[in-house]
Interface confidence: medium
């Protein structure tokens, strides 16, 4: 019969013959012959292959380097790579999460709407009227102005988005 020029899915052509690909999690040891099946071997402890393949070497699992702020989000298997994420308070510089940068701080006048996670940066929001933040921080939210009235005091100095109100004693002199 004519040697094949194309093979079925999960097969590959070698020496004019269709051989079975190795399944995910296994690497190729030897091609099939007229008399033998393709020989495959499982990947080692820290290795993987995630597709039907004819690779002679498995890929090493990604190393989540703690010196780059990375930690393991999901341990790799023989069929999947390790997924890294960033330590709390740091976020990935790319979708592949190859390194981390620290969350940004929110400047005075801005508060933290959402603290950073492993995949997102700090989200800051301007402090609305009645609220303030007087520091640069990656953790501090906008906080409400002090209520002078509840302390039986009056506002001596109005608050801003960066400063609290200043309360003072009520003027006792009444007309």
């Amino acid at each position: 019969p004519e040697p094949p020029t194309a093979c079925r899915e999960k097969q590959y052509l070698i020496n004019s013959q269709c051989c079975s690909l190795c399944q995910p999690g296994q690497k190729l040891v030897s091609d099939c012959t007229e008399f033998t099946e393709t020989e495959c071997l499982p990947c080692g402890e820290s290795e993987f292959l995630d597709t039907w393949n004819r690779e002679t070497h498995c890929h090493q699992h990604k190393y989540c380097d703690p010196n780059l702020g990375l930690r393991v989000q999901q341990k790799g298997t023989s069929e999947t790579d390790t997924i890294c994420t960033c330590e709390e308070g740091w976020h990935c510089t790319s979708e592949a999460c190859e390194s981390c940068v620290l969350h940004r701080s929110c400047s005075p006048g801005f508060g933290v709407k959402q603290i950073a996670t492993g995949v997102s940066d700090t989200i800051c929001e301007p402090c609305p009227v009645g609220f303030f933040s007087n520091v640069s921080s990656a953790f501090e939210k906008c906080h409400p102005w002090t209520s002078c009235e509840t302390k039986d005091l009056v506002v001596q100095q109005a608050g801003t988005n960066k400063t609290d109100v200043v309360c003072g004693p009520q003027d006792r002199l009444r007309a």
Epitope: N67, L68, G69, E87, W90, S99, C100, V101, L102, H103, R104, S105, V112, N134, V135, S136, S137, A138, F139, E140, K141, H143
Partner: nanobody, 119 residues
Framework: EVQLLESGGGLVQPGGSLRLSCAAS????????MKWVRQAPGKGLEWVSS????????YYADSVKGRFTISRDNSKNTLYLQMNSLRAEDTAVYYC????????????WGQGTLVTVSS
């Protein structure tokens, strides 16, 4: 010169409590985000808790949530970590740190204080 000096560590039984202190000097403590991190024997660094400059906003690792409380006294330039319901897995050297916003995680560290939880 920035200095952070932790104290309050020691040996405690499971279920016990400890209060760590960190005396800070050499920088504007009241304007700084502060954190506690820890390192268990043979393990890497683990973030424990963070506190905002005014002390109004606090954050905790899931492993300590509901058991540990971070606080600060800006008039005394001191950071605290109240640790309750301690477990064997809390055994570690605890460091207070002034947050740095470039990697390596923290720009200034204390020398650490050892907490051992054992019966």
């Amino acid at each position: 010169e920035v200095q952070l000096l932790e104290s309050g560590g020691g040996l405690v039984q499971p279920g016990g409590s400890l209060r760590l202190s960190c005396a800070a000097s050499g920088f504007t403590f009241y304007a700084s985000d502060m954190k506690w991190v820890r390192q268990a024997p043979g393990k890497g660094l683990e973030w424990v808790s963070s506190i905002s400059p005014n002390g109004w906003d606090t954050y905790y690792a899931d492993s300590v949530k509901g058991r540990f409380t971070i606080s600060r006294d800006n008039s005394k330039n001191t950071l605290y970590l109240q640790m309750n319901s301690l477990r064997a897995e809390d055994t570690a050297v605890y460091y207070c740190a002034k947050a740095d916003y470039t990697y390596h995680s923290f720009d200034y560290w204390g020398q650490g204080t050892l907490v051992t939880v054992s019966s």
